[in-house]
Interface confidence: low
């Protein structure tokens, strides 16, 4: 029902603690450069205003939309133009244009230092001094670096963070207690951030239909016993929640997410037997538990898919009359039967089936035309399977660092215009997928790999859109969300690329490399490797192996030498000459 005061309604639904947290996240995600203290001041002002509206919903401004209230608050900041430049121009616009304008100024790659973790002693001192402020600071630091983080989930991670500190700050060995807990929270939170960023990109760049298809596939895999109608109901609510969060309407998003969790718990008998353990938990944990829930067992005796989607004489009629419902049903039926497939695979199969029907239903004998549709879709299953098998074999053979190097070569050949540090960063990220997924059982490997790759490629696409350098990357990023990964996989050596002239400078090293931590050392070597590929994009695998071998031997020799710098100065030019000869 309509509420006189939207902000009072959300304050009552969420409670003061969560309300304040969500206001802080909202401000930090939009005003990423502002100091913490400035945000705390604004949060308190907004909270006091909400309380006044709870007391009297008819009070001045209480009837305004929450987005308008936030916009007014932001536009009243005296130093807005000074700090944020053209973001201040948004304030000349009327809502909803002002909201859209603010959204466009969110920075996915803000120029902020990494969020460093202080020593356990310092952490515990700060936490004990004022734990609300400490957790607020955590929300602020994460939000400004991840402006699309799923806000209600961030509240959950803040709660986990608080629990870890509460427990470990009393332990004898604080570091031993805290480090594994905080490492686990950080890793999960980073994945959560990337997952939400993909959802927002899906909605913003490819529209609601793309997001709904993604959700149908995912939920059908998780809840194979639920009816299609039930899945559709949940998808509709989930789309609303996700749109709100991606749009920066975090109070509405968190409140509607609570409602969705409540609905699912009330209807758990018709959704999944696994919901039981989630539904007894408190609000934040309940929603998180549902998000991470293990998939339910498949119902027994499911009929062959061909019965409804090939043999049925009404296929074209059903397709013509209610295209989205029919294709949604196909996606649901296919996904619930294949929990081992990635979302991308399932969506590509559904797309392939749709294309086949588009063609066949216009022909004289539609059935004869689409009778072999499942055989024709088989390559969409075989291609990723083969790719995962080959890459995991390579990973097993080379280890993570060697696998990253192979990917650095591969991706530099695909998009040599991309900057060297970016190529190294993504080769390392892609390489870590091997560590995450290749050790899993066969049934989980495929979905793990492709689902992670989707997150990494989405980040690459978002940053590339900001500063485009490669037409091929733009093409793969924008043409189709589900075909991103196959598009990148299909790229080979860029024939249009003019190789970089050879600069000995790029391959000159000094004794400083010997003292670097292992990760930094690897990155430096990978930078040189990428530069090498930019110089010789068509070098053979053998040539690359030889050069990398010589390079490793050179580093080992000089780092073991008494006079390291002299060794680098003397042997460096020899190595460069040798490499040039190898690659000639």
């Amino acid at each position: 029902e309509a509420h006189k005061s939207e902000i009072a309604h959300r304050f009552n639904d969420l409670g003061e603690g969560h309300f304040k947290g969500l206001v802080l996240i909202t401000l930090s995600q939009h005003l990423q450069k502002s100091p913490f203290e400035e945000h705390v001041k604004l949060v308190n002002e907004v909270t006091d205003f909400a309380k006044a509206c709870v007391a009297d919903e008819s009070a001045q401004n209480c009837g305004k939309a929450i987005a308008t209230l936030f916009g007014d608050k932001v536009c009243a900041i005296p130093s807005l133009r000074e700090t944020y430049g053209e973001l201040a121009d948004c304030c000349a616009k009327e809502d909803p244009d002002r909201v859209e304008c603010f959204l466009q100024h969110k920075d996915d790659n803000p120029n902020l230092p990494p969020f460093e973790r202080p020593e356990p002693e310092a952490l515990c001192t700060a936490f004990k001094e004022n734990n609300d402020r400490f957790i607020g600071h955590y929300l602020y630091e994460v939000s400004r670096r991840h402006p699309y983080f799923y806000a209600p989930e961030l509240l959950y991670y803040a709660e986990k963070y608080k629990n870890a500190l509460t427990e470990c700050c009393e332990a004898a060995d604080k570091a031993a207690c805290l480090t594994p807990k905080l490492d686990a929270i950080k890793e999960k939170a980073l994945v959560s951030s990337a997952q939400q960023r993909l959802k927002c990109a899906s909605l913003q760049k490819f529209g609601e239909r793309a997001f709904k298809a993604w959700s149908v596939a995912r939920l059908s895999q998780k809840f194979p016993k639920a009816e299609f109608a039930e899945i559709s109901t949940i998808v509709t609510s989930l789309t609303k929640v996700t749109k709100e969060c991606c749009h920066g309407d975090l109070l509405e998003c968190a409140d509607d997410r609570q409602e969705l969790a409540k609905y699912m718990c009330e209807h758990q008998d018709s959704i999944s037997s696994k919901l039981k353990e989630c539904c007894v938990k408190p609000t934040l944990q309940k929603a998180h538990c549902i998000l991470e829930i293990q998939r339910d067992e498949l119902p027994t005796e499911l009929p062959d898919l061909a019965v409804d989607f090939v043999e049925d004489k009404e296929v074209c009629k059903n397709f013509a009359e209610a295209k989205d419902v029919f294709l949604g049903t196909f996606l649901y039926e296919y996904s619930r039967r294949h929990p081992e497939y990635s979302i991308g695979m399932l969506l590509r199969i559904a797309k392939g089936y749709e294309a086949k029907l588009e063609k066949c239903c216009a022909e004289a004998d539609p059935h004869a035309c689409y009778a072999k549709v499942f055989d024709e879709l088989q390559p969409l299953i075989d291609e990723p399977k083969k790719l995962v098998q080959q890459n995991c074999e390579l990973f097993d053979k080379l280890g993570e660092y060697g696998f990253q190097n192979a990917l650095a070569v591969r991706y530099t050949q695909k998009a040599p215009q991309v900057s060297t540090p970016t190529l190294v960063e993504y080769a390392r990220k892609l390489g870590s997928v091997g560590t995450k997924c290749c050790s899993l059982p066969e049934t989980e490997r495929l979905s793990c790999t492709e689902n992670y790759l989707a997150l990494i490629l989405n980040r690459l696409c978002i940053l590339h859109e900001k500063t485009p350098v490669s037409e091929r990357v733009t093409k793969c990023c924008t043409e189709s969300l589900v075909n991103r990964r196959p598009c990148f996989s299909a790229l080979h050596v860029d024939e249009t690329y003019v190789p970089k002239p050879f600069h000995a400078d790029s391959f000159t090293f000094h004794a400083d490399i010997c003292t670097l931590p292992e990760k930094e050392k690897q990155v430096k070597k990978q930078m040189a490797l990428v530069e090498l590929v930019k110089h010789k994009p068509k070098a053979s695998e053998e040539q690359m192996k030889t050069v990398m071998g010589d390079f490793a031997a050179f580093l080992k020799k000089c780092c073991d030498a008494d006079n390291k710098e002299a060794c680098f100065t003397e042997d460096g030019p020899k190595l460069v000459a040798k490499c040039q000869a190898t690659l000639a």
Epitope: P421, D505, T508, F509, D512, I513, T515, L516, M527, A528
Partner: nanobody
Framework: DVQLVESGGGVVQPGNSLRLSCAAS????????MSWVRQAPGKGLEWVSS????????LYADSVKGRFTISRDNAKTTLYLQMNSLRPEDTALYYC????????SGQGTLVTVSS
């Protein structure tokens, strides 16, 4: 894209000091060691000094050891070179680079030491 912008150069008398800065962007600054290199008029590139990503390890060419100090501010993604007791032979274009390489990314900043 990667950007390195050097500043702080100028004309000074022998024995005086200068502080060079290099503002970095477009890459994960803390993940990379950084260096200063220089090119004297009509000469090739010469490595001057390097610093690790965390700032804990530094290295200097013999010609500048004891006079120059390299440092970095990871929060500001900026590299510095404090140059004391400058000599005429320090006259050169100074560049900051990613890693220990002798590649020139920025425009460089000119240091002239002359009486």
């Amino acid at each position: 894209d990667v950007q390195l912008v050097e500043s702080g150069g100028g004309v000074v008398q022998p024995g005086n000091s200068l502080r060079l800065s290099c503002a970095a962007s477009g890459f994960t600054f803390t993940s990379f060691g950084m260096s200063w290199v220089r090119q004297a008029p009509g000469k090739g590139l010469e490595w001057v000094s390097s610093i690790s990503g965390s700032g804990s390890d530094t290295l200097y060419a013999d010609s500048v050891k004891g006079r120059f100090t390299i440092s970095r501010d990871n929060a500001k993604t900026t590299l510095y070179l404090q140059m004391n007791s400058l000599r005429p032979e320090d006259t050169a274009l100074y560049y900051c680079t990613i890693g220990g390489s002798l590649s020139r990314s920025g425009q460089g900043t000119l240091v002239t030491v002359s009486s």
